[in-house]
């Protein structure tokens, strides 16, 4: 269906002299120029009533006719005014003007709400020449109007660098209400009030709003848009929507789910990512958040040894990144680990407990009673020590590491020796004479190298000196033992 907006005034001579014939639809234009190439020409409508040009935005030509009479002002004829139509209908409207034939290049452009309409619009300009004047009718058609076509349309004509502007044609596209604000899904605290907003516009106005909760209308009387629904509180999940009504009909918003916040579900899939002697890296998959963001998580650790006192260590961490390194654990120990997370409502239950073990640790104590003496006959240094009191968690002793540093005349050289776990003595070759040898020993397990013993120093003289008394690990408080010969 096409709404035809007929010009309310037929082309009426603006100028002295005859104007043969009135423009009817059966007139074929002598010249028809599309507004832009490639567009379908719009059907023309015939003006139907007598009228006169208005005196609004006019151009007063400076040119005079052969008889030297000044030409009257140029102006578009009055427009239809206001066209109201439904969405998806077609519409055509026009503006017309009569121009003396002395003017050659006249172009008419269409404008909407202050912006020129360029591109894919069906605009056509038709010319009806006569002896003295040419009637120009510019028509504009829209095949299927949308809300965005709402607005004020005008014609502009440039003639001799003057701009003539028509009166506006108001195009009002009416349709079903159009939502500008719909209710949004929310997560709410049980029995706590909250608001939902719904706003829809026409035209036509007004738009009335009904609220719907779980398929039942909430308000018996409609509210004018925009509407705010205050829900006093919910005890269970509900679905809300709003209906917008105007004279054209009804539009229903999307349904939105309002969830009730609850404590989270316990985390799942707690797993061990990495174990060391004194730490365990764990990860977990968070449970359902109870419609409220996780705030933090708690890792609970207890010794799995039945003989332990059952105390639980608690480590708090942020909810992200679902990863935590538990530290300060004993080596070679078994632990039960559980994870719980909280949101604003409260703590989840603890995840299923998992078993985890730390690995062997490095020895925690250095070998004791380290003694060093020089065996000059074999040009060796003999070293003796006592095995350290290893804890079970430190793991099985696999050997010792001996560090001996030789210092002479500003030169220092460190050497390391690995010794098997059997025995508690070692012999190293003298590297430099007339030098000080500093010895330290550490026990070694599969868990690593333990602390080194306190240094024991012995002076290695030049060849030919007598045997020496041994040098040994000092008593506590004597930090730098040196055997003086």
């Amino acid at each position: 269906a096409i709404t035809e907006a007929r010009e309310e005034a037929k082309p009426y001579p603006l100028f002295p002299g005859p104007f043969p014939g009135s423009l009817q639809t059966d007139h074929t234009p002598l010249l028809s120029l599309p507004h832009a190439s490639g567009y379908q020409p719009a059907l023309m409508f015939s003006p139907t009533q007598p009228g006169r040009p208005h005196t609004g935005n006019v151009a007063i030509p400076q040119v005079t006719s052969v008889e030297s009479k000044p030409l009257p002002p140029l102006a578009f004829k009055h427009t239809v005014g206001h066209i109201i139509l439904s969405e998806h209908k077609g519409v055509k409207f026009n503006c017309s003007i009569s121009v003396p034939n002395i003017y050659q290049d006249t172009t008419i452009s269409w404008w909407k709400d202050g912006k020129e309409l360029l591109g894919a619009h069906h605009a056509i300009t038709q010319f009806y020449p006569d002896d003295e004047v040419t009637a120009i009718i510019a028509s504009f058609s829209i095949t299927s109007v949308q809300r965005s076509d709402n607005g004020s349309y005008i014609c502009k004509m440039k003639i001799n660098n003057e701009e003539i502007v028509s009166d506006p044609i108001y195009i009002e596209v009416q349709g079903l209400p159009h939502f500008t604000k719909q209710p949004e899904s929310m997560n709410v605290t049980r029995n706590t009030a909250f608001n939902l907003t719904c706003q829809a516009v026409g035209p036509p106005e007004p738009v009335n709003i009904f609220w719907v909760q779980n398929s039942s209308r909430v308000n018996e009387q409609p509210e004018k848009s925009p509407s705010v629904l205050t829900v006093p509180g919910l005890t269970e999940m509900a679905v809300f929507s709003c209906e917008a009504h105007n004279d054209k009909g009804l539009t229903v918003s999307k349904g939105v789910q309002i969830n009730i916040k609850a404590i989270p579900s316990p985390p799942t899939e707690v797993s061990i990512r990495n174990s060391t002697a004194h730490s365990i890296l764990i990860s977990w998959v968070p449970g359902f958040d109870g419609y409220s963001p996780f705030r933090n998580c708690s890792i609970q650790v207890k010794e799995a040894d039945p003989l332990s006192n059952g105390s639980v260590m608690i480590f708090n961490t942020s909810a992200l990144p679902h990863l935590y390194q538990i530290k300060q654990l004993q080596a070679l120990a078994n632990y039960s680990i559980g994870v719980s997370c909280m949101n604003e409502i409260g703590w989840s239950a603890v995840s299923p407990w998992i078993l985890a073990s730390t690995t062997e640790g490095a020895p925690s104590v250095a070998p004791l009673n380290v003694t060093v003496f020089l065996n000059e006959s074999s040009d060796n240094v003999d070293i003796r020590w006592m095995k350290p009191p290893t804890k079970q968690q430190d793991g099985e002793l696999v050997g010792y590491r001996i560090s001996h540093v030789w210092q002479s005349a500003g030169i220092s050289k460190e050497l390391l020796e690995e010794v098997g776990q059997n025995g508690s003595r070692a012999r190293i070759s003298v590297q430099v004479h007339n030098a000080t040898c500093t010895v330290r020993i550490a026990a070694v397990t599969r868990g690593g190298v333990g602390p080194f013993s306190d240094p024991v120093k012995i002076f290695i003289p030049a060849h030919g000196w007598v045997d020496y008394a041994p040098s040994s690990t000092p008593a506590p408080g004597n930090a730098d033992p040196v055997l003086i010969i």
Epitope: Y170, E172, P203
Partner: antibody, heavy 115, light 110 residues
């Protein structure tokens, strides 16, 4: 909705601004008009401000009134009131951006100009 | 500016009757004409726009017609609640010609 405020008793020559506060629609979409009604008289169109802020006045009102707006209010300034300006001043929502028919009216605010 | 002339200034009719109010524009205004109803002490209410389009919620007893310079508001099946003053208003090219109101017609319902 539309509501006027600021009407009061003023002496002639004392500028007065009447404010119209809107809710439920956007002034970037709809134009607003000002209309007045003297006691026992008919409606008299003063002027209009469209959605993009262009102002139009009745020829008799030019220079006597100034219309301006913010995002939610429209002001009418009576630059130099005379006793003939005593009236109830209505602000009204236009049917569109530039369409000067009025589909929502405020309750009006009374301006009295007296010595 | 366009001048709007409204006639009659007052009209009286019985319940169930019909009232016709005329409005004339000093120049052609197409169909850009609105009709309003105002009861004493109340704000005006839009009845008709674009000369013949009924505003939302307005009973079909109200009808508008005309274009160009001559317009008519007809109220049929008159009810007591229709007692009010009725105004026409042009909004044709409001940027050029203003938005003048007619002088009003008082409708008295007997």
């Amino acid at each position: 909705s539309v509501e006027e405020s600021g009407g009061r008793l003023v002496t002639p020559g004392t500028p007065l601004t009447v404010t119209c506060t809107v809710s439920g629609f956007s002034l970037s979409v709809y134009g607003m008009g000002w209309v007045r009604q003297a006691p026992g008289k008919g409606l008299e169109y003063i002027g209009f401000i469209n959605n993009v802020g262009n102002t139009y006045y009745a020829s008799w009102a030019k220079g006597r009134f100034t219309i301006s707006k913010t995002s939610t209010t429209v002001d009418l300034k009576i630059t130099s009131p005379t006793t003939e300006d005593t009236a109830t001043y209505f602000c009204a929502k236009g049917g569109g951006g530039d369409w000067g028919y009025f589909n929502i009216w405020g309750p009006g605010t009374l301006v009295t100009v007296s010595l | 500016d366009v001048v709007m002339t409204q006639t009659p200034a007052s009209v009286e009719a019985a319940v169930g009757g019909t009232v016709t109010i005329k409005c004339q524009a000093s120049q052609s205004i197409g169909n850009a004409l609105a009709w309003y109803q105002q009861k004493p002490g109340q704000r005006p209410k839009l009845l008709i726009y674009a000369a013949s389009n009924l505003a939302s919620g307005v009973p079909s007893r109200f009808a508008g017609s005309g274009s160009g310079t001559q317009f008519t508001l007809t109220i049929s099946d008159l009810e007591c609640a229709d007692a009010a003053t009725y105004y026409c208003q042009t909004y044709y090219a409001i940027n050029r010609y203003g938005g003048a109101f007619g002088g009003g017609t008082e409708v008295v319902v007997k």
